[in-house]
Each structure stands twice: as C-alpha cells, then as structure tokens.
Interface confidence: low
C-alpha cells in the first residue's frame, strides 16, 4: 500500500501564505498579520521584517513575502536585501570613522557613496592630461603630444605632484 | 496596477486538451503564487490548483488530478493551465486569480466551449 | 473538503436596504474567510478576506464579521452597483471551497 505525498505529509498541501498547523491536526491556517510564508508546506510563518529608523519600507510584506526596505535619503544601502545603511556623502567625499572627509589631493569620488580613488594616470598610457582632475571627476586623458596633428595646441602635463598617489599627508 | 490578462475564448471537441494563458503584470510575479478556478454556467465557483510560481510547483483539486497542469513562465510573467481529456461538463468560464490573503485579484476569464 | 453553505440564495431589496448574507462552514475555519461579488459576465471581485478586512477601494458599506462557522456580510446601504451575485470562501484548508453564492436583485 504506497501513501500518497500528502498522506505522508498533509502540510505539503498547504499554500504559500499559510501554515501547516500542528495544533490543528496539520490543518493550512493563514498566516497571522505581519507574518509571511513565501513557499507551501512550511510549518511557521517568518515574521515580516520592519523597516524601522533609518530604514524605509519599499515593498510592503504580504502574506506570501517579507517586506523590503531601502534607506531613508541621505543614506544608502549595504549587504544582501539591504541589511544595512550607509551614510552617504558628498560627491569629492568619502565616508571615514570620523564621518565624510573630502578626497586627498590626487584622488576623486563623483558617487554619494564608496571611496576616494586616484586619478587616471593618463602617462602611463602614453597620453596627456586633456582635463585636469577635481576632487569630484577624474581627469581627462587626451592624445599625447606626438599624436597631435602639426598646428594643433599640445596639452601641458600635471605637474609631478598632481601625479595619482602623490597626495600630501 | 495589478492587471491579469487571460487568452480568448476557446471551442474544443470532446476528448481534446485546451491551454489558457494568464499574463501578469503591475507587481513582482514570482512573489504570489497563481490559482484557477472555473464557472459552469449558472454554477458556483470551483477551485482547480495552484501554482507557487517561484519554485513552479503545482497543487491540483482532487477532482482534477490527471487532467489538469498548471505551469508558469516566469520570464513572461505568465501562467497556464491545460485541461485534457475535455468532456462537455468542462464548458465553463476559467479564471487565473492571484492569491494573497485571499484571491484577490482576477483575470476577466476565458470562455471554453466543448460540443462535439 | 469544508463545505460553504450561503443563504440566502436569493434575495430581493431595494436601494438603501440593509442587506445581510450568511455563510456557514461545514468545520471551523477559523476567519480564513473571504467575500467576492460577481456581476453577470464578470470576473469576481475580492470584498473582504479574513472575515473582515476591506480589500484595497471597497467602500465602508460593505463590512464583514464572524469567525469558527458562522460568517456574515453587511452591506448597510445598498446603492445600484450593489445589485450582484456574492459568494463566501474558506482558505482555511486546501481545497479552498466556494459558497453557492447569494444573488442580490432589485424588489
């Protein structure tokens, strides 16, 4: 005598949106407010997440899925399913222990969000500096001298100190 | 806003199989799973399966099993349902409704004739 | 299965009625109850789930109540869009099972 799925476990039965309630000889009971199950046949409801203080609700849970949250402005998101927030800064700032500094000398971050990071070396590609950097964009590499057609104005190079990884202390 | 969009109005001959499309749109798919549920004329709602369309696992009515399939195409955003071995009791509207707390949005329903 | 017995299966009012339909459960379902209205030709529309909770654009008229077996939708002022065929549902347990339906016509 083979049982079916369902004999062998009646909680397969129950949908996404309920419980297989053992209370209640494994009866489907739906899942209580601010509760959730996204796939049939589970044995509890997950709680719905809240998106409290800095966080901000995206998607409102429902009884077959949690809610999902973003940030509030002026911060970001971090981790998998947004399980943190950043602070976000300035464009030419970026986020340290002590809150957002301005980038170095020879370094640019043109994002709320992430790190300072250096200049192009335009030389090392073998071409000039057509637009100098900024704390905010990068610079701007153009042909180098040799490859200027005869009557065009060249573009001076930086300086060595506005060479990437230069910056003062 | 939530709109489910069925396939049209089908005539199919005793023993034949019909396929009804329900395309959705205006919400995430995958995050509410899918039922079916028919109408005979004049008759009172009857609930044929469901699907989970994120893992795309079928539940059928017992009245049902063996005739029926319910499957989704997630990158389409659409689910199906196929009733074989049709007989002229199978003359209904079909419905496709998204399931939350309830059935709570439904597609405008497809008309399946079957006469020989 | 549960069955979902409604009465009753007709009933004549007329606008600005008090409209009161009854649902009984064959077993306690608990409110794992639900109300849709039909109108001819039409796909159901969701009143009220968990026995009685409006779904999203349903007007306060129509208001739900009861739990275990017995199951009751108000509608407290009919209005015109009223007139229509309402049925009961049970999601306590799989398979959900559907009301015979209580249609709503003008006296």
């Known amino acids: 005598f083979e049982r079916t799925r369902s004999l062998q476990d009646p909680c397969s039965n129950c949908p996404a949106g309920t419980f297989c309630d053992n209370n209640r000889n494994q009866i489907c009971s739906p899942c209580p407010p601010n509760s959730f199950s996204s796939a049939g046949g589970q044995r509890t409801c997950d709680i719905c997440r809240q998106c409290k203080g800095v966080f901000r609700t995206r998607k409102e849970c429902s009884s077959t899925s949690n809610a999902e949250c973003d940030c509030t402005p002026g911060f970001h998101c971090l981790g998998a399913g947004c399980s943190m927030c950043e602070q976000d800064c300035k464009q030419g700032q970026e986020l340290t222990k002590k809150g957002c500094k301005d980038c170095c000398f020879g370094t640019f971050n043109d994002q709320k969000r992430g790190i300072c990071r250096p200049w192009t070396n335009c030389s090392l590609d073998g071409k000039s500096v057509l637009v100098n950097g900024t704390k905010e964009r990068d610079v701007v590499c153009g042909p180098s001298p040799a490859d200027l057609s005869p009557g065009a104005s060249s573009v001076t190079p930086p300086a060595p100190a506005r060479e990437p990884g230069h910056s003062p202390q | 806003q939530v709109q489910l969009v069925q396939s049209g109005a089908e005539v199919k001959k005793p023993g034949a199989s019909v396929k009804v499309s329900c395309k959705a749109s205006?919400?995430?798919?995958?995050?509410?799973?899918m039922h079916w549920v028919r109408q005979a004329p004049g008759q009172r709602l009857e609930w044929m399966g469901w699907?989970?369309?994120?893992?795309?696992?079928?539940t059928y009515a017992d009245d049902f099993k063996g005739r029926v399939t319910i499957t989704r195409d997630t990158s389409a955003s659409t689910a199906y349902m196929e009733l074989s071995s049709l007989r002229s009791e199978d003359t209904a509207v079909y419905y496709c409704?998204?399931?939350?707390?309830?059935?709570?949005?439904w597609g405008q329903g497809t008309l399946v004739t079957v006469s020989s | 299965d549960i069955q979902m017995t409604q009465s009753p299966s007709t009933l004549s009012a007329s606008v600005g009625d008090r409209v009161t339909i009854t649902c009984k459960a064959s077993?306690?379902?608990?409110?794992?109850v639900a109300w849709y209205q039909q109108k001819s030709g039409k796909a159901p529309k969701l009143l009220i789930y968990?026995?009685?909770i409006r779904h999203t654009g349903v007007p306060s008229r129509f208001s739900g109540s009861g739990s275990g077996t017995e199951f009751t939708l108000t509608i407290s002022s009919l209005q015109p869009d009223d007139f229509a065929t309402y049925y009961c549902?049970?999601?306590?347990?799989?398979?959900?099972?559907f009301g015979g339906g209580t249609k709503v016509e003008i006296k």
């Open positions: 409704a998204r399931y939350d707390y309830a059935m709570d949005y």
């Open positions: 549902q049970q999601r306590y347990t799989t398979p959900p099972t």
């Open positions: 205006g919400y995430t798919f995958t995050d509410y799973s």
């Open positions: 968990w026995a009685s």
């Open positions: 077993q306690d379902v608990s409110s794992a």
């Open positions: 699907i989970n369309t994120e893992t795309g696992e079928p």
